[in-house]
Every structure is written in C-alpha cells, then in structure tokens.
C-alpha cells in the first residue's frame, strides 16, 4: 500500500513528586517501520530512560505505537518527541501551560 503518515499526539500526565510523564503517540501510519524517541535539548534520551509500546495494527490497515518518559515539572520546554517515518520526520513539543494535548498530522 501507499505511505500513510502518522498522526502524532503528545500528552502529559498528572504531576507526581515534582515529575510528570510525557507520552508521545503515533497512530494511523503505514508502513509499520517508525522511529519515535524523546529528546532533551535536541539530544536523544537513552533507551533505559524511555518506555516504548509495541507497534500494533489499529484495525484500519495502519499502525500505532507510543513512547513515554518521566521529566521534572517545569522543564517541559526542553523536551521534544522526534518522529521519523518513510523518509519524513517531525519534532513535537511537550504542550505548555494548561493545554495537555498536542496533535499534528504529517504530510
């Protein structure tokens, strides 16, 4: 099938002991090969500081996955989710303030 770019969605969890969990979800993409990783100041975090979900079919002939990491509250602006898929790439910031959702579709 033809390439379908992912929809990327960044969310923050509730604060716990001064930390928040930020999750980056990629959905509705094809083919299934994708790079999804958190970056701090532009540099990728190590694998052992991130959690990945499996790349799973979403029932529409496309796929979905996620990556999460814990960061200190107040340092959200230093972190971005980096996505690479079928030669396209994008960088997605952690939402600031009270806006806890950020969606972007890659074309």
């Amino acid at each position: 099938g033809s390439t379908v770019p992912p929809m990327v969605n960044v969310t923050c969890s509730e604060v716990s002991e001064g930390n928040i969990t930020v999750t980056c979800r990629a959905s509705s993409f094809y083919p299934r090969n994708i790079t999804l990783t958190w970056r701090q100041d532009g540099v990728s975090l190590s694998h052992n500081t991130q959690q990945w979900g499996d790349v799973l079919p979403d029932g529409n002939g496309t796929y979905q996955t996620w990556v999460a990491t814990r960061i200190r509250q107040g340092e959200e602006q230093r972190f971005t989710c980096y996505m690479e898929h079928s030669g396209n790439h994008g960088t997605h910031p952690v939402p600031s303030g009270n806006s806890h959702h950020h969606h972007h579709h890659h074309h």
Epitope: D41, V43, L45, R78
Partner: antibody, heavy 122, light 112 residues
Framework: QGQMQQSGAELVKPGASVKLSCKTS????????ISWLKQKPGQSLEWIAW????????SYNQKFTAKAQLTVDTSSSTAYMQFSSLTTEDSAIYYC???????????????WGQGTLVTVSA | DVLMTQTPLSLPVSLGDQASLSCRSS???????????LEWYLQKPGQSPKLLIY???NRFSGVPDRFSGSGSGTDFTLKISRVEAEDLGVYYC?????????FGGGTKVEIK
Amino acid sequence: QGQMQQSGAELVKPGASVKLSCKTSGFTFSDNYISWLKQKPGQSLEWIAWIYAGTGGTSYNQKFTAKAQLTVDTSSSTAYMQFSSLTTEDSAIYYCARHDYYGTSGAWFAYWGQGTLVTVSA
Amino acid sequence: DVLMTQTPLSLPVSLGDQASLSCRSSQNIVHINGNTYLEWYLQKPGQSPKLLIYKVSNRFSGVPDRFSGSGSGTDFTLKISRVEAEDLGVYYCFQGSHVPWTFGGGTKVEIK
C-alpha cells in the same frame, strides 16, 4: 555546513533594548537548534539560550531569562535575540551558533556566526 | 551550575612541541543518556570560536589528527601532538551535559 550571518555592531544607551539577527543559509533552518552566546572582551563565553527553529521552543540559562528573548522567522531563515534593559555589563560580543545533532551524538556549537559587538554607553 | 576550571591559564610552547591542556569540572558531567558532552573550542584573535573536539574524544570534521581529547568523570585533557602556528589562540572546554551549559575560563597557547 551553511552560513550564519549576524547583524552589525550596535551602540545603545543604558535602559534601551537591542534586537540582534542571525540570518542562515545553506541548511534546512527548521531542523536546527540555534544558541546565542555572550563574550565580554578578554573573557570566556556564556551560553544564553537555545531556540528550536522548527517549533520556536526555547530553553534559557536562568541568568538571562529576564534579559533575553529568542525568536525565529522561518520565512527568512533568521534567528533573533532581543536583549532588554541594557546596562554596561551587557557590553559584549554576541554569537549565534548552530547545534549539530545525530541522535545521542552530536556537537553543541558546530557552526558559528561572526559575532555582533554591542556597546552600552551613555 | 557546573564550574569548568582550565589549567594552565597560559601555555608557552615552541612550534613542533606537544601541548597538554587540562579541564576539570566541579561535578560529573555524564548526561542522563549516558554520554559525556565535553567539547573543546579554539578561538583565534578577532575570530569566532571553532569546534575541535566533541563528546570528549571525537574530532570535528576538518580538524587535524594532531588534536586529541581524552578523559572521563571530571578530568579531561586536550593534547596537540605537534603545535603549529595556526594552533595559537585561546582554548575553551565546554560541558553540554547539565543546564546551564558552561565553558571553562580558557587556556592561551602562545609562542615561548
């Protein structure tokens, strides 16, 4: 590699503001992190802040949060730093520099502008 | 903030000599991702700094192999195996592992 061309020298009065520019060419502007740095005559360098051109996201050295404001204009591939409430302590050369990242590898200030001399004097 | 201390302040050399520059950080500068982002820059009079070494020991593109970096933890060294005239200037070490990113005070390499 690309180029980073900074605006010309500025002579400003105490209390005023100045907006410095860093026009880039030869690379994909929106993919890059750009930092601004300060160097007083005969002294070492200080990192002020970075801006990610793709989103406009910034991170500041706390020492400069009330002093500097970074912005970008993607249509002209130009980064800006506005420096406010200037004092004689702000007299320095200000550099823009581009980061060069590859995953967990990479260099912080791989490519530099030529610098802009800012003189604060009554 | 991480304090970066460079020694010596001035290093007089003869052309062709080996030069050794030291940089010490006030705390361990291993990044959260396990890498050590210690860099060396050379600034010649009236010029912008130029990157020589990144991640402790990696030469940046176009940097001659007479420059080598080493070290770990808090102690780092830049060696110039045979000093040439174009190597004269002020050398700065820099850490990019902990915000705010910080530079050392510099070592001036000059002719003896």
